[in-house]
């Protein structure tokens, strides 16, 4: 895992190649701090292997919006499934009070 | 082939300044965080300085701080030393090296093959 | 400023035997950042292990790494007659300096 930057910045090189959406675990952003006064930004992949991203580069400002994107549609997904899950139980409710009833 | 070569080395009394270069080849060097790290005669291994791969960060060894300045020109693939008030006590192999690209801190994994440098009066 | 300490100073073996290097460090280190390097004389520092662990590209397999915390150890399982060497352990902690060992000798009996 990263270390707390206390005393430096975390990433001293970034990765030299080419980081697929598909082969991303995890995608954290570090906004810049007293340690370290710069945006830094750390891919976890499928892996486990973690690499540093040049803030920079346009294709990692890319990787990030279609990261972003991913997250938001997941979270909508879960919301979705939230609702869905309380939809059934409202539905079980109102068929077992009218189990209730009939018997 | 990935390849780093030290130049600027030489004799130089105490007191004064000396400016060492570093040229990297075979790789993206813009995407590196590049070490100087020196070896007096007969000893081990100091780390003298590191700069991050945007040049915006730099960090020194106690005994150097203040006297030396580490910097970087990613457009010519090269890396510096800025040595001032040299002292008899920084005669070394002065090395560069390249802090690992692909993971999140590995090591050095390219050495240059050194340059020396001997501050004698 | 975390002191690394490396015993024994000198190792002498014979080829074939295993090698058994130690690393202290005088406060904890994150496994992640400490390496072992081979120098030979007249040439550059290789990096063999990094990550406490892991085996750098092309590093044969006789060579590993271990441990965590203050205390880490680099094994050479069979020495080859190449291995005989000076090898060093180097912390990359989260604050400078990023201090080297004073080395370990493996010497021919």
């Known amino acids: 895992t990263p270390v707390v930057r206390k005393g430096r910045c975390s990433c001293i090189s970034t990765n030299q190649g080419t980081i697929h959406l598909q082969s991303l675990k995890d995608l954290k952003q570090f906004a810049p701090s007293p340690s370290c006064e710069k945006i830094e930004i750390i891919a976890t992949l499928k892996n486990g292997v973690q690499t540093c991203l040049n803030p920079d580069s346009a294709d990692v400002k890319e990787l990030i919006k279609k990261w972003e994107k991913q997250v938001s549609q997941k979270k909508k997904q879960k919301n979705g499934k939230k609702h869905q899950k309380k939809k059934v139980l409202k539905v079980r409710k109102s068929q077992r009070s009218r189990q209730k009833k009939t018997t | 082939q990935v390849q780093l070569v030290e130049s600027g080395g030489g004799v130089v009394q105490p007191g004064r300044s000396l400016r060492l270069s570093c040229a990297a080849s075979g790789f993206t060097f813009s995407n590196c965080g590049m070490h100087w790290v020196r070896q007096a005669p007969g000893k081990g291994l100091e780390w003298v300085a590191l700069i991050g791969f945007d040049g915006i960060n730099e960090y020194y060894a106690d005994s150097v701080k203040g006297r030396f300045t580490i910097s970087r020109d990613n457009s010519k693939n090269t890396l510096y030393l800025q040595m001032n008030s040299l002292r008899a006590e920084d005669t070394a192999v002065y090395y560069c090296?390249?802090?690992?690209?692909?993971?999140?801190?590995?090591?050095?994994?390219?050495w240059g093959q050194g340059t020396t440098v001997t501050v004698s009066s | 400023e975390i002191v690394l300490t490396q015993s024994p100073g000198t190792l002498s073996l014979s080829p074939g035997e295993r090698a058994t290097l130690s690393c202290r460090a005088s406060q904890s280190v994150s496994s992640s950042y400490l390496a072992w390097y081979q120098q030979k004389p007249g040439q550059a520092p290789r990096l063999l292990i990094y990550?406490?662990?892991s085996r750098a590209t092309g590093i044969p397999d006789r060579f590993s790494g271990s441990g965590s915390g203050t205390d880490f150890t680099l094994t050479i399982s069979r020495l080859e007659p190449e291995d005989f060497a000076v090898y060093y352990c180097q912390q990359y902690g989260s604050s400078p300096p990023f201090t080297f060992g004073p080395g370990t000798k493996v010497d021919i009996k």
């Open positions: 990550g406490a662990s």
């Open positions: 090296a390249r802090d690992w690209p692909e993971g999140y801190y590995n090591g050095m994994d390219v």
